[in-house]
């Protein structure tokens, strides 16, 4: 079949970081400087891509493949391949139109990105809530209230993580 | 414009070796990418052989493994390094670059 094709069509044989060049005749000819082609028996290459601005050089292009982008510190990559940058926003909140805001009581963001997500509501699974939430943290589901009735085994909360420099209060 | 002048052709066995040379001159600071290209008797020119403008050697599958091309920038050359040379290696041999081509230089291979 590989043969057969060869013979009607000679631009399948050109390989990749090569194209087929109609202004000769359809030999293969190499991909000009800052071009490529990553598959063979192309009939162009394509431009690289340049990442500029925001977008700063993860892989530099070859003959055979393309840029690849990602963001420079403080943005995040959004779509397919990296086609956007996006502004990060802190732990706790979320971007708007307007800029990072603080995400609204009883929601919560753990993420430099990505939306304010409602906290968990515990009581739907029967459970109660054994540690709050804040605008970083979901709660944290402890033992439903019958399981906290006395004779019940009590399970004892994890002590709070200390910071640093903080002492115990 | 570019002036490419090839060289190293010859008569060689099955098996033999042989290292063409393509000197370049003039405005040779617009040479990006070279490459070598051979044409057989009554077939069409087609490519063997490439340095690409990021600088890395290709080869068409039928040169891989036997050919090497490499380029000598202090003498503004370029080379084709044939080796475990077939009977289908023989053709005219041309040194290109963008609009530039060579003269060719011939090589035969027979027994």
């Known amino acids: 079949f590989e043969r057969t094709r060869s013979l009607q069509d000679p631009c399948s044989n050109c390989p990749a970081g090569t194209f087929c060049d109609n202004n000769r005749n359809q030999i293969c000819s190499p991909c000009p400087p800052n071009s490529f082609s990553s598959a063979g028996g192309q009939r162009t290459c394509d431009i690289c891509r340049q990442c500029k601005g925001v977008f700063r050089t993860r892989k530099e292009c070859s003959s055979t493949s393309n840029a690849e982008c990602d963001c420079t510190p403080g943005f995040h990559c959004l779509g397919a391949g990296c086609s956007m940058c996006e502004q990060d926003c802190k732990q706790g909140q979320e971007l708007t139109k307007k800029g990072c805001k603080d995400c609204c009581f009883g929601t919560f963001n753990d993420q430099k990105r990505g939306i304010c997500r409602p906290w968990t509501n515990c009581s739907l699974d029967g459970k109660s809530v054994l540690v709050n939430g804040t605008k970083e943290r979901d709660v944290v589901c402890g033992p439903s209230p019958a399981d906290l009735s006395p004779g019940a085994s009590s399970v004892t909360p994890p002590a709070p993580a200390r910071e640093p420099g903080h002492s115990p209060q | 414009a570019v002036q490419l002048v090839e060289s190293g052709g010859g008569l060689v066995q099955p098996g033999g070796s042989l290292r063409l040379s393509c000197a370049a001159s003039g405005n040779i600071f617009d040479i990006r990418v070279i490459s070598w290209y051979r044409q057989a008797t009554g077939k069409q020119r087609e490519l063997v052989a490439w340095?690409?403008?990021?600088?890395?050697?290709h080869y068409v599958d039928s040169a891989k493994g036997r050919f090497t091309i490499s380029r000598d920038n202090t003498k503004k050359t370029t080379y084709l390094q044939m080796n475990s040379l077939k009977l289908e290696d023989t053709a005219v041999y041309y040194c290109?670059?963008?609009?530039?081509w060579g003269q060719g230089t011939q090589v035969t291979v027979s027994s």
């Open positions: 340095i690409a403008w990021d600088n890395v050697a």
């Open positions: 290109n670059s963008g609009d530039s």
